[in-house]
Interface confidence: low
């Protein structure tokens, strides 16, 4: 007799979730020598322990602490790239600019990127049918709490000049309700972080406005300045050109006399 199962509004756990997490962990630790010591079976156990047998609307950051401990990793100062609503370009950028890192370039972010998961109270099963939706069901669900936890930690450990890529095509270029706006901004440590530099990515070819003057960017500047962190903003007018220039900094259409990639 099939058991009754809670119906949530969100899509269910990604198929082959345990295998995917384990395979990603193995791949990551093979490619990143500094993480070779990580035991992927222990990582999976800690991940599983955070949500299996637990009511999926009552997950806490505490549940993820064993996993966070196992995935401890540091980013060199000046090399942290945060992003909001522009994940693909941020990832394309760090794939080329290999010495900069988004959260998804770190072990825990890499494991969970684009995946969904949840369990059920009092059973050892994974729910592949449905998982809680952040808006329609609850915010304390396994996926949302995971990203909040690791995003907080990622921001807390950042140092030097931190960069953030923002989507200039959105009505709110800086959104206080995004993970960046609600978690990361407030967890940058003023004693370690000298400045936050926002890169506002323009959408249209003809868009030559200075989006650094956008009211939401001014709001971000105010929040950051109040935290005693300096704020800078740059327009990236042509994202296609931007990536091309990151790949080929010596290209004549990118360079006009400055023979280094960026000023800090």
């Amino acid at each position: 007799v099939p058991r009754w199962r809670q119906q949530w509004s969100g899509s269910g756990t990604t198929s082959r979730f345990p295998e995917t997490v384990l395979a990603r962990c193995v791949k990551y630790t093979e490619v990143h020598p500094e993480m070779r010591h990580v035991d992927c079976q222990s990582v999976w156990d800690a991940f599983k322990g955070a949500f299996i047998s637990k009511y999926p609307c009552n997950i806490t950051e505490e549940d993820y602490q064993p996993l966070v401990k196992l995935g401890t990793q540091t980013v060199p100062c000046n090399k942290t790239l945060l992003w909001s609503r522009i994940k693909d370009l941020a990832h394309q950028f760090t794939q080329v600019q290999r010495d900069m890192f988004t959260l998804e370039d770190m072990l825990l972010g890499y494991l969970a990127d684009d995946l969904t998961w949840c369990g059920e109270f009092n059973t050892f099963e994974i729910n592949y049918q449905s998982c809680p939706d952040w808006r329609k069901d609850c915010s304390n669900n396994p996926v949302s709490v995971f990203w909040k936890t690791v995003s907080r930690r990622f921001a807390e450990t950042a140092c030097g000049v931190v960069h953030v890529m923002l989507n200039g095509s959105r009505s709110k270029i800086f959104d206080k309700n995004s993970t960046f706006g609600s978690v990361e901004v407030h967890n940058l440590q003023p004693e370690k972080v000298q400045a936050l530099e926002a890169w506002v990515i323009h959408g249209g070819r003809e868009d030559s406005r200075d989006l650094c003057q956008d009211p939401t960017i001014k709001e971000l500047e105010s929040i950051i300045s109040k935290r005693n962190i300096r704020f800078f903003c740059k327009n990236i007018y042509r994202p296609d050109k931007f990536l091309q220039c990151v790949k080929n900094p010596e290209d004549s259409s990118c360079l006009s006399g400055i023979h280094h990639h960026h000023h800090h």
Epitope: I236, S256, I258
Partner: antibody, heavy 123, light 107 residues
Framework: QVQLVQSGAEVKKPGSSVKVSCKAS????????IGWVRQAPGQGLEWMGR????????HYAQKFQGRVTITADESTSTAYMELSSLRSEDTAVYYC????????????????WGQGTLVTVSS | EIVMTQSPATLSVSPGERATLSCRAS??????LAWYQQKPGQAPRLLIY???TRATGIPARFSGSGSGTEFTLTISSLQSEDFAVYYC?????????FGQGTKVEIK
Amino acid sequence: QVQLVQSGAEVKKPGSSVKVSCKASGGSFSNYAIGWVRQAPGQGLEWMGRIIPRLDAEHYAQKFQGRVTITADESTSTAYMELSSLRSEDTAVYYCARGLGYYLYSSYYFDIWGQGTLVTVSS
Amino acid sequence: EIVMTQSPATLSVSPGERATLSCRASQSVSSNLAWYQQKPGQAPRLLIYGASTRATGIPARFSGSGSGTEFTLTISSLQSEDFAVYYCQQYNNWPWTFGQGTKVEIK
């Protein structure tokens, strides 16, 4: 060697407009920024705005917003700065300058300057 | 906007002597700072960019140093053609801003 050649001196009445040109001879400027700076008699240098011809992206200093328009014609390697609603305080030498830099980050220093155009505003 | 403050306003130096000019930014401009020389009736001339890199054709007696908020232009042995007004300019944040200038005059 690139040179920036500016149009000649102008005398204008208050309330009118002036349009100063800046032509790059001996090379193109499309990969560069063109900045406009002014210097009132006996005073220091003041940024007015800049254009990145390749991107048709122009930005103005707040003080001049709404009064200044900077344009560029890539086909003739010429940049233009038009200042409207002239007043006596706008009497100054106006310079164009070529900006070198990684344009994606809009950070430029200026290595080549025009000879300057004196604009006198007087009734 | 970032305010650039130069000191002193006037520097009286004898030919052959060393001149040290200061420039302070109201907030960090990283190394995005340039120095220009201007003689009466002439356009400014780029001397230093990136806080410490000499522009093409600039003699070695001109050197720049500093980063963040404090910058220095040093002329190791003043020649007669070096008497002029010197401006610093930050290009880290728009609007770019100049200092008010330091006049180097013959003592």
